[in-house]
């Protein structure tokens, strides 16, 4: 997990999340997302 401090004085926590593609479809492999402040954005 990485933390980034911004000029506004608060911290935003970034965390990489990995899911298996076959859990949401028929493809194989991994899907990588980024969670920022509790929300998956990518």
């Amino acid at each position: 997990d990485a933390e980034f401090r911004h000029d506004s004085g608060y911290e935003v926590h970034h965390q990489k999340l990995v899911f298996f593609a076959e859990d949401v479809g028929s493809n194989k492999g991994a899907i990588i997302g980024l969670m920022v402040g509790g929300v998956v954005i990518a």
Epitope: F19, F20, E22, A30
Partner: nanobody
Framework: EVQLLESGGGLVQPGGSLRLSCAAS????????MGWFRQAPGKGREFVAA????????YYADSVKGRFTISRDNAKNAVYLQMNSLRPEDTAIYYC?????????????????WGQGTLVTVSS
């Protein structure tokens, strides 16, 4: 939930190999993505590798990629971690864990069933 029991740990020299096994009980084994985590002395529990429900897909931590291989045998309700080119920094207790489908497989909180762990020591 499933019950998990690890085996195969031990003392190995740097550069050596070990194969860890995890036996699972419960008829719902193939509903779970399976992972291995490890915890070195004085450190937190960290993700090592995961394998999908079918065994087709795998994912590895950067620190073990190319050295460790995770696999599973759904007919035997078992998961394996083949560890090659072992290093002293691989010394840890290794835990097998089960995560229900659709959850993030690289984070500890996704896993709701854990084994008791097996100790791997890499030392000359």
């Amino acid at each position: 939930e499933v019950q998990l029991l690890e085996s195969g740990g031990g003392l190995v020299q740097p550069g050596g190999s070990l194969r860890l096994s995890c036996a699972a009980s419960g008829r719902t084994f193939n509903n779970y993505n399976m992972g291995w985590f490890r915890q070195a002395p004085g450190k937190g529990r960290e993700f090592v590798a995961a394998v999908s429900r079918s065994g087709v897909s795998t994912y590895y931590a950067d620190s073990v990629k190319g050295r460790f291989t995770i696999s599973r045998d759904n007919a035997k309700n078992a998961v394996y971690l083949q560890m090659n080119s072992l290093r002293p920094e691989d010394t840890a207790i290794y835990y097998c864990a089960a995560a229900y489908r659709g959850t993030a497989i690289n984070v500890r909180r996704s896993y709701d069933s854990w084994g008791q762990g097996t100790l791997v020591t890499v030392s000359s």
